[in-house]
Interface confidence: low
């Protein structure tokens, strides 16, 4: 349905708190360095039009596109040219393409200081002196940081944001009440950016078929009682949400995912019984809370696949008709028998089944030839079930920190022309999954620990395009979606990497490593670490081990010292030196 | 919303030439990487090439390897695919679509016959 005006339609769906919003946000991710001051200006400035637009839709202007008002807007900020370079050529562009060329420019690993948590005494006088101020800069912040970040779902965050200053600013301990719960926030926010940016990695790179694969299965295993019809529709609605969060048009998309939480509460009945309690929360905690509701339970009387994918013979009639929907239809039965199934693996599977159906089909007896493909599903199964198990034994041995260590050689050997803070950050968040997995009972670990890893991978992919360096990487990132892990999982030590020359700069230690947090000083050492294996890729666990062991016990001798930097200084060489004969 | 319009079919010699393009339109086309498919008669649906969003990085499937060429304007929002030597066996309706190997054509197509 069109509108006379598109901002003025958006303005009264939405309202005017979370227009304010989105836009802040949408411009936040488009003009990642702009100062913050800046993009209030421009916001207010667009508000007030909106305003001028809903009194009267026919007003000067108001029947414009959205990109084209925030365009000509963002293209109105003074020292674009000198902030962004050869983005400022976008605004010699035309609608669409100006729109495009802004999305071609967001930055995934923007050159912005990492954001320092003042005092809280600070933060609480901050939010009392200008509470409205002091959301916006949460906003601001989080989207520049995150330009892919789920725009409605960054409000439900910041709403979060405030409600734990306004609870805990008041409470006898501020800092016991309100740190936790930042830090809670900071956790879910840094899943809910890389979650999304898979997503948008998924629509963008792989088409949205890939994407309705995804959600086909995911949306099935959530809803096993709904019916295909049903789980369809919630598909079509979920990948237009997401194609314009992805595009950068905020306001489309946050209309519409309140469009299909409305939808979905509507319809509970045919949907899951699990969405009741959602439906009774206001709109940006209900569309959460049915973002993440649990899986409904299976119905009891499923029948076996068998018959229809396997046994029947109108399998390739069936699947010429309607190739999409027959492989959707498949895809939805055996995801809503699955919930113990990563999303990837069912993935594989319809990848399997579908290869199957296009050989046997062209045989002279199809039936015959396809009458074994649910065995050929075995190993698929198996080796993500492996994976899990050894891991998790693995993690359950060393603890969180050493199992990072271990991932961190593991990685680094396979591709050691990534950038060290690359595989630092990546090794350590994929070390992550085990406690955030391996604690869970067996029907929930493989689901758990293969998708979440996805995530973790995409973000290697994503970095690592902006910075290609490793035909490996560009390989596994760009050759199948739901390959992605498999194809890390089985490269081996890179046999043609010539290792990196000893440089002691890099192994020089100072006393302000004393003062840092055990997060930050583990990522020093981390660091250390991948570099050592870049300079030999071929040392054994054991040497490696020895040389981690000497370095923590360098630091925490010279760290107890009373002249500190003096014992670094003169125990850091002997280290160096021992490090390079142990690892000769 | 999204558009794809496919044109440059048409009647063809075998060893011709064409060269197909696709106009896009309610979409990031710079952000997103983008194939050509094609159906023969009473066929289905065959991946034919893919590029990348920035038109870097281009694959074929094999039965036109050599033969043909897959490329994009991102200032026109335009996908184009020249297609030389051509054989009866690519007679077919051409379609583009949003996406690499994979991915789903959703505008008219463009027929493209190759008969003496």
């Known amino acids: 349905d069109t509108h006379k005006s598109e901002v003025a339609h958006r303005f009264k769906d939405l309202g005017e708190e979370h227009f304010k919003g989105l836009v802040l946000v949408a411009f936040s991710q488009y003009l990642q360095q702009c100062p913050f001051e800046e993009h209030v200006k421009l916001v207010n400035e667009v508000t007030e039009f909106a305003k001028t637009c809903v009194a009267d839709e026919s007003a000067e202007n108001c029947d414009k596109s959205l990109h084209t008002l925030f365009g000509d807007k963002l293209c109105t900020v003074a020292t674009l040219r000198e902030t962004y370079g050869e983005m400022a050529d976008c605004c010699a562009k035309q609608e669409p393409e100006r729109n495009e060329c802004f999305l071609q420019h967001k930055d995934d690993n923007p050159n912005l200081p990492p954001l320092v948590r003042p005092e809280v005494d600070v933060m609480c006088t901050a939010f009392h002196d200008n509470e409205a101020t002091f959301l916006k800069k949460y906003l601001y912040e989080v989207a520049r940081r995150h330009p892919y970040f789920y725009a409605p779902e960054l409000l439900f965050f910041a709403a979060r944001y405030k409600a734990a200053f306004a609870e805990c600013c008041q409470a006898a301990d501020k800092a016991a009440c309100l740190l936790p719960k930042l830090d809670e926030l900071r956790d879910e926010g840094k899943a809910s950016s890389a979650k999304q940016r898979l997503k948008c990695a998924s629509l963008q790179k792989f088409g949205d078929r890939a994407f309705k694969a995804w959600a086909v299965a995911r949306l099935s295993q959530k809803f096993p009682k709904a019916e295909f019809a049903e789980v369809s529709k919630l598909v079509t609605d979920l990948t237009k949400v997401h194609t314009e969060c992805c595009h950068g048009d905020l306001l489309e998309c946050a209309d519409d995912r309140a469009d299909l939480a409305k939808y979905m509460c509507e319809n509970q009945d045919s949907i899951s019984s699990k969405l009741k309690e959602c439906c009774d929360k206001p709109l940006l905690e209900k569309s959460h809370c049915l973002a993440e509701v649990e899986n409904d339970e299976m119905p009891a009387d499923l029948p076996s696949l068998a018959a229809d994918y396997v046994e029947s013979k109108d399998v390739c009639k069936n699947y010429a008709e309607a190739k999409d929907v027959f492989l959707g239809m498949f895809l939805y039965e055996y995801a809503r028998r699955h919930p113990d199934y990563s999303v990837m693996l069912l993935l594989r599977l319809a990848k399997a089944y579908e290869a199957t159906l296009e050989k046997c089909c062209a045989a002279a007896d199809p039936h015959e030839c396809y009458a074994k493909v649910f065995d050929e599903f075995q190993p698929l199964v198996e080796e993500p079930q492996n994976l899990v198990k050894q891991n998790c034994e693995l993690f359950e041995q060393l603890g969180e920190y050493k199992f990072q260590n271990a991932l961190l050689v593991r990685y680094t050997k396979k591709v050691p022309q990534v950038s060290t803070p690359t595989l630092v950050e990546v090794s350590r968040n994929l070390g992550k999954v085990g406690a955030k997995c391996c604690k869970l009972p067996e029907a929930k670990r493989m689901p758990c620990a293969e998708d979440y890893l996805s995530v973790v991978l995409n973000r290697l992919c994503v970095l690592h395009e902006k910075t290609p360096v490793s035909e490996k990487v560009t390989k596994c990132c760009t050759e199948s979606l739901v390959n992605r892990r498999p194809c890390f999982s089985a490269l081996e030590l890179d046999e043609a990497y010539v290792p990196k020359a000893f440089n002691a700069e890099t192994f020089t230690f100072h006393a302000d490593m004393c003062t840092l947090s055990e997060k930050e000083k583990q990522v020093k050492k981390q660091t250390a670490l991948v570099e050592l294996v870049k300079h030999k890729p071929k040392a054994t666990k054991e040497q490696l081990k020895g040389v981690m062991d000497n370095f923590a016990a360098f630091v925490e001798k010279c760290c107890k010292a009373d002249d500190k930097e003096a014992c670094f200084a003169e125990e850091g060489p002997k280290f160096v030196a021992a490090s390079q004969a142990a690892l000769a | 919303q999204v558009q794809l319009v496919e044109s440059g079919g048409g009647l063809v010699q075998p060893g011709g030439s064409l060269r197909l393009s696709c106009a896009a339109s309610?979409?990031?086309?710079?952000?997103?990487?983008m194939s050509w498919v094609r159906q023969a008669p009473g066929k289905g649906f065959e991946w034919v090439s893919s590029?990348?969003?920035?038109?870097?990085?281009?694959r074929y499937a094999d039965s036109v390897k050599g033969r043909f060429t897959i490329s994009r304007d991102n200032a026109r929002n335009t996908l184009y695919l020249q297609m030389n030597s051509l054989k009866p066996e690519d007679t077919a309706v051409y379609y583009c679509?949003?996406?690499?190997?994979?991915?789903?054509?959703s505008g008219q197509g463009t027929q493209v016959t190759v008969s003496s």
């Open positions: 679509a949003i996406g690499g190997p994979g991915a789903s054509p």
């Open positions: 590029i990348n969003n920035g038109g870097s990085d281009t």
């Open positions: 309610g979409f990031a086309f710079r952000g997103f990487g």
